[in-house]
Interface confidence: low
């Protein structure tokens, strides 16, 4: 069967296409090419008589067509109007006709696109930006690239106008990137130059560094302020509410206690119209801003109730500090048996009672800092049992209970035997 193959099928403007004939019959008289899907004398391009090898142009001949002896037709310098169907009409020697139709499509060679923007300096969380890929080209596909990667999926990104327009809603600083558009059709693909999206933002809340609050007299105070901002923020400093200077750094040499106060950094972005402040308290003092952890020393940690006394000492190398004592989360002293001395350094318990058993710790502090010791455990034992708890029956001692002694009975069998011997000795 007679067929026509277009090579290529999609043709770029200005290029050429070959309408290649397959299965051409033998014993031909001649053939003709027509523009369109049917034989129409008014749309004949060219005719060819084999016997005379004569080619005759028809009404649709443009001067760009060449016919070959094998009936194939070459069309050069293709124009948009050439798109469509072409019909070959073959006349055999027996005057029986045969027809075949082929087609091709013509596309423009795409120009390099460019990006137009409706907002060259959008403000973060406020503005939208619409990029449009120019020019508008029929039958072209539009693609977008961000930092040379395909568009991320985001509810803030919207494609419209046949993907020719990319809109970013509520832009953020992270949208600051390189944007390109690409146009494609079956015969070409072109990419634009980058457009850099410049999102204006900030200032964010400023950070004052270093983070120190306490300084010694005579030190140099050097504070730096930074706030993320585009364009960069302009900074100013206030001390106790009074303007000092318009710089990013504040330097005060040889400070005194009079330099204590509130230090405010003010960051301003004149383009976004926003400003932010951070306040930092500076304290100039001889006192140590870090109190070392104190240690407790005990005269003994296991004592006999109603008999022994104990001294607990809170040791610290810091000066200008105060000391307080705690027992089972209660502040001491809590009874007349407890005495504090040497500026609360020493806690004396005399005599020790059963209820004094437990954990003790001390805390050292000054007006700006404090620290606690590790706890120390005080154990209280009873070596002698009170008389009223013992009954003498046939020289045997029996425990009668009462006064909570039952609690320590099992733990104090040795002391019990010692008490028996002690009791016998006195009777």
């Amino acid at each position: 069967k007679l067929t026509i193959e277009s090579t290529p099928f999609n043709v770029a403007e200005g290029k050429e296409v070959l309408l290649l004939v397959h299965n051409l019959p033998q014993h031909l008289f001649g053939y003709s090419w027509y523009k369109g899907e049917r034989v129409d004398g008014n749309r004949q391009i060219i005719g060819y008589v084999i016997g005379t090898q004569q080619a005759t142009p028809g009404p649709a001949y443009s001067g760009r067509e060449i016919i070959y002896p094998n009936a194939s037709l070459l069309i050069q310098n293709i124009i948009q109007n050439d798109t469509g169907f072409y019909t070959l009409h073959v006349i055999k020697s027996d005057l029986v006709n045969e027809e075949a139709t082929g087609q091709f499509r013509v596309y423009p060679e795409l120009p390099k696109p460019s990006i137009s923007s409706n907002n060259s300096k959008p403000v973060e969380d406020k503005d939208a930006v619409a990029f449009t890929c120019e020019p508008e080209t029929q039958d072209a596909t539009y693609l977008w690239w961000v930092n040379n990667q395909s568009l991320p999926v985001s509810p803030r990104l919207q494609l419209s106008n046949g993907n020719r327009t990319l809109t970013l809603f509520n832009v953020t600083r992270n949208d600051s990137a390189s944007y390109k558009c690409e146009t494609q059709n079956p015969v070409s693909a072109r990419r634009s130059d980058s457009v850099i999206l410049n999102v204006l933002y900030g200032p964010d809340t400023p950070t004052i560094s270093p983070s120190d609050t306490y300084y010694r007299p005579g030190a140099n105070l050097s504070l730096s302020c930074y706030a993320a901002s585009n364009p960069p923020a302009q900074y100013s400093w206030l001390i106790n509410g009074t303007f000092q200077q318009s710089t990013q750094e504040l330097f005060i040499p040889n400070i005194t206690v009079n330099n204590s106060g509130s230090y405010t950094c003010h960051a301003n972005n004149s383009v976004t119209g926003c400003n932010r402040t951070t306040v930092k308290t500076i304290i100039v003092t001889e006192l140590s801003p870090v109190v070392a952890k104190p240690q407790i020393k005990a005269s003994k940690t296991t004592v006999t109730g109603d008999k022994d006394s104990v001294n607990l000492t809170c040791s610290t190398n810091d000066t200008g500090i105060s000391i307080r004592w705690f027992f089972k989360n209660q502040s001491l002293p809590s009874s007349e048996r407890m005495k504090l001395s040497q500026g609360n350094i020493t806690l004396s318990i005399n005599p020790v009672k059963r209820e004094d058993a437990g954990t003790y710790w001390c805390e050292v502090f000054n007006p700006i800092s404090k620290n606690q010791s590790d706890p120390i455990m005080l154990n209280v034992n009873y070596n002698a049992l009170p008389q009223e708890n013992l009954i003498n029956v046939d020289e045997q001692l029996y425990f009668q209970g009462g006064s909570g002694l039952n609690d320590i009975f099992e733990a104090q069998k040795i002391e019990w035997h010692e008490a028996r011997a002690h009791h016998h000795h006195h009777h």
Partner: nanobody, 118 residues
Framework: EVQLVESGGGLVQPGGSLRLSCAAS????????IGWVRRAPGKEEELVAS????????RYADSVKGRFTISADTSKNTAYLQMNSLRAEDTAVYYC???????????WGQGTTVTVSS
């Protein structure tokens, strides 16, 4: 994310030289124009120099012509500003910026301080 990071600022005596660097990320400097903007207290902001790598176009402010040279290394994605014969009036914070042929500038770095003082 587009970022510009400047370096190379410092204290220099009048007549001395400095070379500022601007390392770009998030885009290709060959696709656009890069410039240096300076900001000094009490003075107008000034675009001192810019270079458009794709066209080879450079421009300089009159105040720095013949003293400053802008260049770019596309393989390092970095722009440079060579500053010679520095004067006290060149003292400023210098920002790297993305610019245009027309001298507009928008996307800024965070700046590097140049102090010219004896």
């Amino acid at each position: 994310e587009v970022q510009l990071v400047e370096s190379g600022g410092g204290l220099v005596q009048p007549g001395g030289s400095l070379r500022l660097s601007c390392a770009a990320s998030g885009f290709n400097i060959k696709d656009t124009c890069i410039g240096w903007v300076r900001r000094a207290p009490g003075k107008e902001e000034e675009l001192v120099a810019s270079i458009c790598q794709y066209s080879g176009y450079t421009r300089y402010a009159d105040s720095v012509k013949g003293r400053f040279t802008i260049s770019a290394d596309t393989s390092k994605n970095t722009a440079y500003l060579q500053m010679n014969s520095l004067r006290a009036e060149d003292t400023a914070v210098y920002y790297c910026a993305i610019t245009s042929h027309h001298g507009d500038y928008n996307y800024w770095g965070q700046g590097t301080t140049v102090t010219v003082s004896s």
